[in-house]
Structure formats: C-alpha cells, structure tokens
C-alpha cells in the first residue's frame, strides 16, 4: 500500500481497459494507473477483474479477492501489447458475463465498472458500447468511464451512468495519475460504522450508517439499508435520509439477545449489495436503561 486515501467497500470491481493500437506508446501509463488504483481498494470482501479490449475482448483476470492472484493479474496486465480497433462493447460483454454468473449464485454483490478508452467510438461501435453498458447496468452494475486524449465526452456520458460518472483526462496519458484520488472518491461506496452498534433486543431503533458514496447511486430513491441476520435472513429497509457520508435507517426489530445483523447497502433497490464487516448486535436492556 502506498498510503493516502483507501476504499473499504466490499463489492466487485471490473477494470475494462482499451488496448487498441492508439494506446501502444502509453500502455505503461494505463498499467500504472490501474496498479495504483487497485491497491487502494483494500477490503478483504472486494473482488477485482481485469478485462482488456481492442478488436476483441479478453478477460485477463477473472473476478478474485485473492491478493496474490491480483498481483499476478497486474503482472499480466503489464505485459499486454496493444493493437487493433476500439471495440469497447467486447469489454462490457466480458464484464456482463461475469456479473450474470455471480448473480446466479443467489446473493448479489454490487458491481462497479471502470472503463478506460482513448478514442472516439464511431457510429456502430458507439451503439454497441452503449447497449452493452446498459446490459451491465441491467445486471446491477454502476458504470464509470475514464476518457483520455481524443475521447468524446458526450458518448462516454451515455456509456457511463451519467455525466458525473465520466472522468475526462484532457492532458494526455501522463495526467492519469492525477485523477486517481477523484476516481477513488467517486467509485468507492463503503460502510464504515453503525451507530448504535448495539441495540436492545425486541425494541425498534434507528441506525446511522456511516460511510462514503451513498449518493453515487443513479437514483438515490433506490438506496436501501440491508440487514443480514445471523447469516441467513436478509431484511431491506428504506432509509429516512440519504447523504453522501451517512444513511439514517430504521433497524429491524431483533427479538433475541445475541442476534447479529451484518450491515449491507444496496444502491439499486435490492438488485445487488455492498457488503461490510460492520455488525449490529442485540443485548438485553432492562427498563430505564
């Protein structure tokens, strides 16, 4: 780790990277950008995948939380030799495939896609890219785009979730390092704490969920607090208020002492969830305490 800000959110992070001919002399900058960013996502529950695209898409590293596999994936990424066209949709297809398989497992982990490209997408290629990005969104993904050099910001705003999900890098590839902090800040959705972390068995409570990025949802009305009780039943609650650094949520009534509720947040009405290691436990409260 190289210090500085980090992200503690537990979600699935997909890097979709342009390796077309136009980035041939800039691959090192793309690699170092990904490497720096990858090291800032430090939750043990965070999984990562590296996908590259040119005339075809390739999954260089499938989704994994194994830090050794991620290290090896980064090594492979460094060895990539760019060449070919900018078929961005091929990259999104590879991400959608993985999200689809993960969703079939039952529990749906939130997916964040960071797609990087350096060129304008011509006609059909833009149509296909937007369509595939929409498919990824339909499967529950949040899509960010990084545009370097000759990109078309209007196109990227339609491929990404919104204009606010686009990171323009107008000063060329060497300027990629300069946006790491802002990408981290915008793409990181994390749950850091719950107040109170202990509640009285059988009583109704409100919980303040502290964290970051809760207003990064495409639609804040779709944000949910989720409580996974004793690793089995999941209860979703609509928050009373949604701010970027906290949620105010009704807590479920947990009848027995010693019950544990793991805190999760959904940004898309329960389609998928950001996990955390934050736990709310119940205790016995005598009257007046």
């Amino acid at each position: 780790e190289d210090g500085g800000p980090a992200c503690y959110g537990g979600f699935d992070l997909y890097f979709i990277l342009d390796k077309s001919g136009s980035v041939l002399h800039h691959w090192n900058e793309i690699y170092y950008f990904v490497e720096q960013l990858a090291h800032k996502f430090i939750s043990p529950q965070l999984r990562m995948s590296f996908i590259v695209f040119s005339t075809r898409g390739t999954t260089l590293m499938k989704l994994t939380e194994d830090r050794e596999q991620i290290r090896q994936g980064l090594e492979e990424l460094q060895k990539v030799l760019p060449g070919g066209d900018t078929y961005m949709h091929e990259g999104f297809e590879r991400a959608s495939e993985q999200i689809y398989y993960e969703n079939r497992q039952g529990y749906r982990t939130a997916s964040v896609i960071i797609a990087l490209t350096d060129g304008e997408l011509h006609e059909d290629l833009f149509f296909y890219s937007e369509r595939e990005a929409n498919r990824s969104r339909d499967l529950g993904a949040i899509v960010y785009c990084v545009g370097v050099k000759d990109f078309n910001e209007t196109q990227l705003a339609r491929i990404a979730d919104s204009k606010d999900h686009v990171f323009p890098v107008n000063d060329g590839f060497q300027a990629l390092q300069g946006i790491i902090h802002s990408i981290l800040k915008k793409s990181c959705i994390e749950i850091l704490a719950a107040e109170p972390s202990t509640i009285c068995a059988g009583e109704s409570f409100q919980v303040v969920v502290r964290g970051n990025g809760f207003r990064h949802a495409r639609n804040v009305d779709r944000v949910l607090c989720s409580f996974k009780i004793n690793d089995s039943v999941t209860l979703n609650e609509k928050p009373f208020s949604v701010e970027d650094t906290y949620l105010l949520c009704p807590a479920p009534i947990l009848k027995e002492v010693g019950m544990k509720a793991a805190l999760q947040v959904s940004m898309n009405d329960g389609l998928s969830f950001i996990s955390s290691s934050v736990i709310i436990t119940t205790t016995h409260c005598s009257d007046g305490s």
């Epitope: 075809r56 898409g57 390739t58 999954t59 260089l60 499938k62 091929e90 297809e93 590879r94 959608s96 495939e97 993985q98 689809y100 398989y101 079939r104 369509r131 498919r135 339909d138 499967l139």
Partner: antibody, heavy 118, light 108 residues
C-alpha cells in the same frame, strides 16, 4: 418451476424444412442475459449447438449451419421457434432447447427425436 | 472458432476421484461449463463458470480452469455418476457455443 418442451414432426423427408417449437414456462426472456438455445445430438454422437436468441432479439447461429437456420421468438406465447431448411438424413438427431445466458444452459427440455428419411 | 478437446473415456473405481479434462487454446480466459448426460436423458448442468455448482448438484462435483485446461473433478465417485460428460464454452469472437466431444465415465 422452469420447464421447456420441444414440439415438432418426428419424421421429415429429405430437402424439406423442419420447424421446431420450444414452449417454456417459469422464466421470462425479459431477464437481462437470459436466452434460449437449440442443441442437437445425432444418435450415439456428441452434442452440437445450433442457435441462440436473447431478450434483445440478438440471434446467433452455428457457423457450419448458419445458412440453413432461422431462430425467432414470440415472447407473448413464451415460445422460441427454430427452422432448418434442406433437411438431410445426416440431420437425424434428438433436438433439444435449453435456457441459457452466456453459454451455460441450466435447464433443458426432454428433447424430440427427428428422423430424416424418404 | 475455438475447439475443446476431451478424452473419449475415463475409468475410475468407486470411491476414488475422477478427473475429466477439457483443453483449448487459452481456455483460462473463457468460462467453462460441464454437463452430465445419462443414456436416454437430456444433459444436466453440473458445473458452470469454471467452478460454480448449480443448486441440487452434489458437493463431490467441482471444477477448475487454468492454463490451457479446464478440469471436472468428481471426488468419491459413485456408481450413479457413470455417464457422458461434456464441457462447453462461449466463443465471444464468433458468438457461438462450443461443446467438447464428450467423455464417457465408467465406474468400475
């Protein structure tokens, strides 16, 4: 409960066109990533994928049979139809339809045996 | 189009571990699925996306994928596991599904 059932003629003559219908229930083609594939298996031989159709009406075909196949769907009837032109005795096989997304087919129909003979 | 190659047959003693391979160029960058087919029956998906088990499939079935080979492993093989096994994958470049030639598993 997800179910698929193939229907069509048991016997077709050489050069004729085969039309097979897959009627499904328990799922919707409106789910992102979801689709229906057709697969066939000649007696005693391996499985061979034929065609796939998905929510967005994208159609994909086996390279070797592309010119003879047409796949279509009627979402309101929960049906997917496969037509295969210019049938030949080597096309004698059990034809299956299956639900799948990206190449994984998690639920299959029971299959229908089609014999091509004059 | 990609090609997936399987051994025609594999034999295993009851209770032992059976391994069925499926090889293809750079297969590890693709997702491999495995189907079990018993005589006169439709195929059944036993492993999808390299190593995921659909509900209802026994834990003795597992999958892996690295290098140029994907492997279906059946630990503690039972007589009822005797069947044909097919691997398959999605060829994105041609937008089609490819099956291996199948492996007949015999439980001795």
């Amino acid at each position: 409960q997800v179910q698929l059932k193939e229907s069509g003629p048991a016997l077709v003559k050489p050069t004729q066109t085969l039309t097979l219908t897959c009627t499904f229930s328990g799922f919707s083609l409106s789910t992102s990533g979801m689709g229906v594939s057709w697969i066939r298996q000649p007696p005693g031989k391996a499985l061979e994928w034929l065609a796939h159709i998905n929510l967005d009406d994208d159609k994909y075909y086996s390279t070797s049979l592309k010119t003879r196949l047409t796949i279509s769907k009627d979402t309101s009837k929960n049906q997917v139809v496969l037509t295969m032109t210019n049938m030949d005795p080597v096309d004698t096989a059990t034809y299956y339809c299956a639900r799948g997304g990206y190449g994984d087919m998690d639920v299959w129909g029971q299959g229908t045996l089609v014999t091509v003979s004059s | 189009d990609i090609e997936l190659t399987q051994p025609p047959s594999v034999s295993v003693a009851p209770g032992q571990t059976a391994r069925i391979s499926c090889s293809g160029d750079n297969i590890r960058s693709m997702f491999v699925h495995w189907y079990q087919q018993k005589p006169g029956q439709a195929p059944v998906l036993v492993i999808y996306a390299d190593n995921k088990r659909p509900s209802g499939i026994p834990e003795r079935f597992s999958g892996s994928n690295s290098g140029n080979t994907a492997t279906l492993t059946i630990s503690g093989t039972q007589a009822e596991d005797e069947a044909d096994y097919y691997c398959s994958s999605y060829d994105y470049n041609a937008h089609l599904v490819v099956f291996g030639g199948g492996t007949k598993l015999t439980v001795l």
